[in-house]
């Protein structure tokens, strides 16, 4: 007999699932309506193709990025798509709430839903750190919880720092990274003893996390210049990003190579340090003046980010109960600040330039953003991770980890759990 | 020669909808480089930016008038249509559509500077019962 | 918002005088200033773009400097067509661009 949801999570998980769900129905029966104005048809499919590469993104790319694990592959990608799910639905409520609640309705436009993919993309990067550690209802909690700290955060940098929409979103890479390092670090981390094969990859999984990290690599581009107006300014950060991206490709796979005693290529350092490039330039990558800077970039992240999976693994295992193919955690989080690090350098050279004497000024605000995004993760993280520990959600217990079994039906199998 | 002709009511009441159409020639709505914004100017007040749209459709707006705005563009006709929604007494002003141009400088980083290069004649609106 | 300041928000000046107007920008915004002069019961037209970059067709005095959160334009020698209200615009953020509120050059 397969295995079943304890019975307390049979009840609490649909209940606690579609009572939201009905909450967000009247949220948007109350509070939003279309946008009216006459799109022009032409802008209107190039806008919603953007917000289509984000969806393949988050569904596909990140669903099956995360799906190399033995026995949690179909938890993965399906956990994804609904956390994706609702992320969206709650992340719009909330942009337009916080944007432009005084008039008392929220416009949703092509644009808002885009917003809204990004922002529950945050989920879906942090994710990985917990996932096989916890329950959908469990996951429902981390989703709202993410989505309003992330936008909250968006909303006091927009008007402290005076930031647009792309700068103040090129801030999801370091947020959710540790938004979900530190839910990992408060959630129960000892594997007990014979179930240490559930978090080691098998070669079908990872072939379809390679294929996440395929869809991630070709629709990058997409997501760097997604919130950028200007088509010129849109066109140089796919430009960029492009040639990031492809640079981080052959440097991943060369690393790889170098940092193995026979030259042999790691899967998980490859599905990670393949996305390197994109990540470094995110938050500069309309500002790039040209494609050799992109690329050094690219190069730069590609060797931290193997260099990374190489050594930190064992780290983020010991002190978080990181399993080793979770590796988007600690990437995202070097490769986060590596993009922060590399805007404020670029501006700072800017400055010289220019010799205009506010150096000091554009880096402490920069600074000021940074921080202000990793304490507001870190703090929303813990909070979330102490909510998760709750005895209220059932959370799988330590020896049902990583385990599909838990949650699914698999009518061939003859002995459940 | 480029040219913006902004036309629309000349009187509008409290509360209606205000409808504006700028009318361009001389350069499309198309052109990467190029944009369409609305500025208006109340009597013997400072210039208020409104509203723009660029060449791919993406829109952006003053955030005080926000909820109130709606641009939209129709390139086959080379228009640009500004709504704005429960008008008020306040609101009585020149409004003017200009073209804003996109000039790109790269350094250090790339630079894009915008400008407002060419301007319509405006169109005065009152706003009375 | 980014908040403009222009100062004088008025002045008198004769022909052939140097007249400088400032604008105060309330954060960084790099070189993202233009400039504009509006005479009475006329469109704007723009003068200089890039906080110094002089717009094809404009006489060579006028000029513009400055970067961060202080500019200038600067009239190197006043004409008689040159009195009107000018006014600075940010471009920093693409696209929530802000006016200053007018500087007002009247003849003494």
């Known amino acids: 007999m397969s295995s079943k949801y304890p019975r307390s999570v049979r009840r609490c998980l649909p209940l606690w699932a579609l009572t939201l769900e009905a909450a967000l129905i009247l949220l948007f029966y109350f509070f939003t309506h279309y946008d009216a104005s006459l799109e022009d048809q032409k802008g209107l499919v190039a806008s919603y193709q953007v917000g289509q590469d984000l969806t393949v993104m988050a569904a596909i790319g990140l669903g099956f990025l995360t799906s190399s694990f033995r026995r949690h592959s179909w938890s993965s990608v399906a956990f994804n798509l609904f956390m994706l799910a609702l992320g969206v639905q709650w992340a719009i409520l909330l942009d337009g709430f916080l944007s432009q609640f005084p008039s008392g309705k929220v416009v949703i436009t092509l644009f808002s839903i885009r917003l809204a993919t990004m922002s529950a993309l945050s989920v879906l990067i942090s994710v990985d750190a917990v996932l096989g550690k916890v329950n959908l209802a469990q996951l429902v909690v981390m989703v709202l919880v993410e989505v309003t700290a992330l936008g909250n955060l968006r909303m006091v940098i927009s008007n402290i720092f005076n930031t647009d929409y792309h700068m103040n979103m090129m801030h999801i890479y370091v947020f959710a990274a540790y938004f979900g390092l530190s839910v990992a670090w408060c959630l129960p981390k000892p594997l007990p003893e014979g179930t240490e094969d559930k978090d080691q990859t098998a070669t079908i999984p990872s072939l379809s996390a390679m294929l996440g990290a395929l869809f991630l690599w070709m629709f990058w581009p997409s997501f760097n210049s997604a919130l950028l107006r200007s088509p010129i300014e849109r066109k140089n950060a796919v430009f960029n990003t492009y040639y990031a991206v492809a640079v981080s490709v052959v440097t991943a796979i060369s690393g790889s190579s170098l940092a193995h005693p026979q030259g042999k290529i790691s899967k998980t350092y490859v599905h990670s340090a393949v996305l390197a490039g994109g990540v470094a330039v995110g938050t500069s990558c309309h500002l790039i003046p040209s494609p050799w800077l992109a690329m050094v970039l690219g190069l730069v992240a590609g060797l931290i980010s193997v260099g990374g999976a190489k050594y930190l693994p064992g780290c983020c295992n010991r002190v978080l109960g990181i399993p080793h193919s979770s590796i988007m955690g600690y990437n995202f989080s070097l490769l986060g600040l590596l993009g922060e690090i590399i805007y404020i350098v670029l501006l700072v050279l800017d400055t010289v330039g220019a010799g205009n004497g506010m150096i000091g000024f554009q880096v402490l605000l920069s600074i000021g953003e940074l921080s202000l995004a990793i304490v507001i993760a870190l703090m929303s993280g813990l909070l979330t991770g102490l909510l998760l520990n709750l005895k209220i959600w059932k959370a799988p217990h330590e020896a049902k980890y990583f385990d599909d079994q838990v949650f699914w039906k698999f009518p061939h199998l003859a002995v459940g759990f | 020669q480029v040219t913006l002709k902004e036309s629309g009511p000349v009187l509008v009441k409290p509360t209606e909808t205000l409808t504006l159409t700028c009318t361009v020639s001389g350069f499309s709505l198309s052109n990467a480089r190029m944009g369409v914004s609305w500025i208006r100017q109340p009597p013997g007040k400072a210039l208020e930016w409104l509203a723009h749209?660029?060449?791919?459709?993406?829109?952006s707006y003053s955030t005080s008038l926000k909820s109130r705005l709606t641009i939209s563009k129709d390139t086959s006709k080379s228009q640009v249509v500004l709504t704005m929604t429960n008008m008020d007494p306040v609101d009585t002003a020149t409004y003017y559509c200009?073209?804003?141009?996109?000039?790109?400088?790269?350094?250090?980083?790339?630079?894009?500077?915008?400008?407002?290069?060419?301007w319509g004649q405006g169109t005065t609106v009152t706003v009375s019962s | 918002d980014i908040q403009m300041t222009q100062s004088p928000s008025s002045l008198s000046a004769s022909v052939g005088d140097r007249v400088t107007i400032t604008c105060r920008a309330s954060?960084?915004?790099?070189?993202?200033l233009n400039w504009y002069q509006q005479k009475p019961g006329k469109a704007p037209k723009l003068l200089i773009y890039?906080?110094?970059t002089l717009q094809s067709g404009v006489p060579s005095r006028f000029s513009g400097s400055g970067s961060g959160t202080h500019f200038t334009l600067t009239i190197s020698s006043l004409q008689r067509e040159d009195f009107a209200t000018y006014y600075c615009?940010?471009?920093?953020?693409?696209?929530?661009?802000?006016f200053g509120q007018g500087t007002k050059v009247e003849i003494k």
């Open positions: 954060q960084s915004i790099s070189t993202y």
């Open positions: 615009q940010q471009t920093y953020r693409t696209p929530t661009w802000t």
């Open positions: 200009a073209r804003m141009r996109l000039t790109m400088v790269r350094g250090v980083i790339t630079y894009y500077y915008y400008s407002m290069d060419v």
């Open positions: 749209i660029f060449s791919n459709d993406e829109k």
């Open positions: 890039a906080a110094s």
